[in-house]
């Protein structure tokens, strides 16, 4: 359905409109301004932007804007008592020691409050002993090591290199394997791409390079003192005892420049295979210990960061909508940076704030949206998605009443070889239908359209002629509108070519060196990239709010659950056996994807046909739509993750990042091989076949004539 | 009442190509999966592709992939099979069947008449 | 070689009972939804039963169809003259992606 009918408008307020008036050097001049000084989250810095945000959007003439403080648990360095890494001989003496700084960029030397490189929220401590290297310590790293090469972790400090997962799932792996400390590490391998300089030079990582981020293992839960609940100023909070996901062992992050000297001298096993190897001229040996001459050395950690409750502050935008102004569309990236911030997330928040600006001049104009747009630049992404997650648990009530959608808005690139999107089923024809209305900034594909350029570079795995469009998993501030309230969602950035570039995310994810010279000299000059992801949120945005009937297609649903439902029944059969010694049947979940696949067919026919100026069934219909993704969440959540609500996507129980497709089924035949009761092992099977049977079959009954 | 009605077959060289139509009527077109299938001289019936109903996810047998692609237009109620680099085993008359039950392929409840298809030098 | 499998034919004198097994695996037919074609010499197929067991209007009682594991039965009843044709399995292959028919099986009707 066109946007065209947009509503009380001059023909000329539609998507071309807003689409034309959103401008590449306008963007290129807000992450400038947003990008000059460090702006971590619960810092003066970070506040006095939020004001300043707030104060331009009420500029560019949004009806509203507010900022929503919370009073979360973050996490910082001890200013007097820096964390570092030595290596000790017998006596205890420390014979070399990791860097305290990142070496600043050139210009940037006598910027202050550069935060230095830390894993936030580990706890303090000093623990020493031998090394052992676990890969990328991800669940199958930990399995080579303690079933294949009966290699024990307990009481081992264990280094691991970056890449592949969330380093707070590599975390949580070390703290059950019995480690007693972990050192993360960037390993040329993954950071440095072949062929490119280092920053300042080109877009590579430096051996003085380090990675922050958080190392929370929080589920969804938001502030780990309140989990469920707002930190407003009345909250009850539990004691750090209780607190939700913090990490009970210290964890501190290396560039590899300081890798290589830990490295260097490991002895112990050598790597089982060639996985195991990065790219430095070290052995990769497991350990555990050092080799020979260097056996009596010993690594020491020395972490003494501190938990401390701060402020945090979110801006929230409002556009009332003309006609259904109690249906919220809402577009959300996050302002707190580690440090400058050039791409995560300032690209992302340059993104919004010019459309913001684009919808404001619209409004100037005469125009509305059909429905509210809300605009949010969330706080404290960085430190666990806490300020989109306080701002929706305090708003629980009405997002689930009135949430249409939401569309993320961090960091807008990665790379600047092709679109990559993430989004649930139902915004699949949104986004094909709009990227083939968009023009291709790609070098090759002028005249083209998005859509030609992203299918052609990033063909999906098994629909031929189609782009790839991946699950939503987390890592970002959809988590709690997709994962705990069943609105529907969907994110969309440029990124880089995954064959060709190996490396994990970007290579300075995360360090000083993500400055705005690292995208206006290396990444996107032109700023093109940046203006084809505006075109596209903003794009996503406009359709969501202002069409008569909502570009939600609930077949594309029906498509996906078929293909879920195969998979899992394929990962299943793999223990034929088993399967009928405790009677484990898929029917009950074929049969209600089949349902599904049916009433959704019937549904969509109905669309087609209903009349649409009758505005209460159109309100009708719109609500059925609305409310599908909201079908699929189980108030009880997934076992012991109960903010992650959403039967049919969760994120990987062995990488945040990752979506995974009815993850408790998925969850309770992970590793069933090897549970000491297999008979509860396979109940567990079949009751989460039963809850996603239920759950697929109650969610096919709301497309259902009503009456 | 449903009718699925096929063109394009005729006779084309090894190698060649040739594209087919199947024209449907009588019912909500894009809520429903189609499939072409073929069925060699005296042979029995083989699927051959399908194509879902909303954006149009698709599905290929393994003999065909890489070589036919499907698609329709849902504004035009039409299906298309673009068959490219034929062989002489594709010989055969191609149906356009409708799914019974919407999006995915489950069964077949209505089907065309049929084309031949001969590939031959 | 289909998918599945299906005895190329079968014969039984007008009046009489006849049955169809069609054979598959745990990914086909054990777990998806079994359907049966007719297809009378010189025309198009066309759907007997879906579902496993289930008839669309217009065709007689005198076709059934069963489902048992990873094997399917077509049964028909009462065989007329007009019954003479190939008979097809169906189903969908988790495994695969994609749609299998069994080989077909010609009726005769001695």
């Known amino acids: 359905k066109s946007s065209n009918e947009a509503t009380n408008i001059t023909p000329k307020h539609n998507m071309k409109a807003f689409l034309d008036e959103l401008k590449a050097e306008n963007i290129k001049k807000f992450l400038y301004n947003f990008t000059q000084i460090p702006h971590l989250a619960g810092t003066e810095q970070n506040f006095q932007l939020a004001k300043q945000i707030q104060s331009q959007w009420k500029e560019f003439g949004l009806d509203s804007v507010e900022l929503a403080h919370y009073d979360v648990l973050l996490s910082y360095p001890n200013k007097t008592h820096p964390n570092y890494i030595s290596i000790i001989n017998e006596d205890g003496n420390e014979i070399f020691n990791t860097s305290l700084f990142e070496p600043p960029p050139p210009g940037y030397e006598n910027v202050s409050d550069i935060v230095p490189p830390f894993s936030a929220f580990s706890p303090q401590g000093m623990p020493e002993g031998d090394l052992v290297y676990v890969n990328y310590a991800r669940t199958e790293d930990f399995f080579k090591l303690e079933r294949d090469m009966k290699i024990n972790c307990s009481g081992k400090i264990v280094i691991a290199r970056y890449g592949k997962v969330f380093r707070g799932n590599k975390v949580k792996n070390a703290q059950l394997a019995g480690a007693k400390g972990v050192i993360l590490y960037s390993d040329p391998a993954d950071y440095f791409a072949p062929g490119v300089k280092s920053y300042p030079d080109g877009w590579n990582l430096p051996g003085g390079g380090v990675q922050r981020g958080n190392i929370l293992n929080l589920n969804g839960a938001g502030d780990p003192l309140t989990p469920g609940y707002p930190a407003n100023e009345y909250a009850y909070r539990r004691g750090i005892a209780e607190a939700v996901g913090l990490p009970s062992i210290p964890v501190h992050p290396i560039g590899y420049y300081d890798a290589q000297k830990l490295l260097e001298k490991m002895g112990g096993s050598a790597p089982p295979d060639s996985s195991w190897r990065g790219s430095l001229k070290v052995p990769y040996n497991v350990g555990p210990g050092f080799t020979g001459n260097f056996s009596t050395q010993k690594v020491k950690m020395h972490i003494h960061s501190t938990n401390e409750v701060t402020r945090i502050y979110n801006v929230i935008g409002t556009l009332r909508g003309a006609v259904e102004p109690d249906r919220y569309v809402i577009l959300g990236g996050h302002r707190d940076s580690w440090v400058f911030g050039g791409i995560d997330p300032q690209s992302g928040a340059a993104v919004v704030h010019e459309i913001v600006r684009s919808f404001g001049t619209l409004k100037k104009e005469g125009w509305r949206p059909r429905r509210t747009i809300l605009f949010a630049s969330w706080d404290a992404e960085e430190f666990g998605l806490l300020g989109s997650t306080e701002w929706a648990e305090e708003n629980s009530r009405l997002l689930q009443e009135r949430g249409v959608a939401y569309i993320n808005a961090d960091s807008s690139i990665e790379g600047n070889y092709t679109l990559r999107v993430d989004c649930t089923p139902l915004m699949y024809s949104l986004v094909h239908n709009l990227t083939k209305e968009l023009k291709s900034p790609d070098e090759g594909f002028e005249g083209k359209s998005l859509y030609e350029s992203w299918t052609k570079k990033s063909p999906s795995p098994e629909f031929s002629g189609m782009p790839r469009i991946s699950k939503l998993g987390s890592g970002n501030d959809f988590e709690v509108f997709f994962q705990r309230l069943g609105i529907a969602s969907g994110r969309a950035r440029y990124t880089k070519n995954w064959e060709t570039n190996k490396f994990s995310g970007y290579p300075l994810y995360h360090s000083v060196y993500e400055t705005y010279e690292l995208v206006e000299k290396f990444y996107d000059p032109m700023f093109k990239y940046h203006l084809t992801v505006a075109q596209v949120r903003g794009g996503m945005v406009f359709e969501l709010a202002n069409s008569i009937v909502l570009p939600f297609d609930c077949r594309d649903y029906a498509v996906v659950l078929r293909k879920y439902a195969d998979k899992i029944y394929s990962i299943s059969m793999k223990h034929p056996q088993e399967m009928k010694t405790y009677s484990v049947s898929f029917d009950s979940l074929f049969s209600a994807v089949k349902n599904f696949t049916e009433i959704a067919s019937k549904f969509s026919e109905r669309l087609q046909d209903f009349d649409k100026s009758n505005p209460i069934v159109l309100r009708m219909m719109n609500d059925q739509l609305m409310f599908l993704e909201r079908a699929f969440i189980d108030p009880l959540g997934l076992p012991d993750r109960p903010f992650y609500r959403h039967v049919i996507y969760a994120p990987s129980s062995h990488n945040k990042y990752a979506g995974e497709s009815f993850p408790g089924i998925y969850d309770a035949l992970f590793d069933i091989e090897s549970k000491v009761d297999p008979s509860k092992a396979w109940g567990e099977v079949k009751r989460q076949i039963y809850v996603a049977a239920f759950t697929v079959q109650a969610a096919a009954e709301t497309l259902s004539e009503v009456a | 009442e449903v009718q699925l009605v096929e063109s394009g077959g005729g006779l084309v060289q090894p190698g060649g190509s040739l594209r087919l139509s199947c024209a449907a009527s009588g019912f909500t077109f894009s809520s429903y999966a189609m499939s072409w299938v073929r069925q060699a001289p005296g042979k029995g019936l083989e699927w051959v592709s399908a194509?879902?109903?909303?954006?149009?996810?698709?599905y290929y047998a393994d003999s065909v992939k890489g070589r036919f692609t499907i698609s329709r237009d849902n504004s035009k109620n039409t299906l298309w099979l673009q068959m490219n680099s034929l062989r002489a085993e594709d010989t055969a008359v191609y149906y356009c069947?409708?799914?019974?039950?919407?999006?995915?392929?489950?069964?077949?409840?209505?089907w065309g008449q049929g084309t031949l298809v001969t590939v031959s030098s | 070689q289909s998918v599945l499998t299906q005895p190329p034919s079968v014969s039984a004198a007008p009046g009489q009972k006849v049955t169809i097994s069609c054979s598959g695996s745990s990914s086909n037919i054990g777990i998806n939804y079994v359907s049966w074609y007719q297809q009378l010499p010189g025309t198009a197929p066309k759907l007997l039963i879906y579902d496993n067991n289930k008839r669309p209007s217009g065709i007689p009682d005198r076709f059934s169809g069963s489902k048992s594991g990873t094997s399917a039965t077509l049964g028909i009843t009462g065989l007329q003259t007009g019954d003479e044709a190939d008979y097809y399995c169906g189903t969908w292959d988790s495994s695969l992606s994609a749609v299998v028919f069994g080989g077909g099986t010609k009726l005769t009707v001695l």
């Open positions: 194509i879902s109903g909303g954006i149009g996810s698709t």
């Open positions: 069947a409708k799914d019974g039950v919407g999006a995915t392929p489950y069964y077949f409840d209505y």
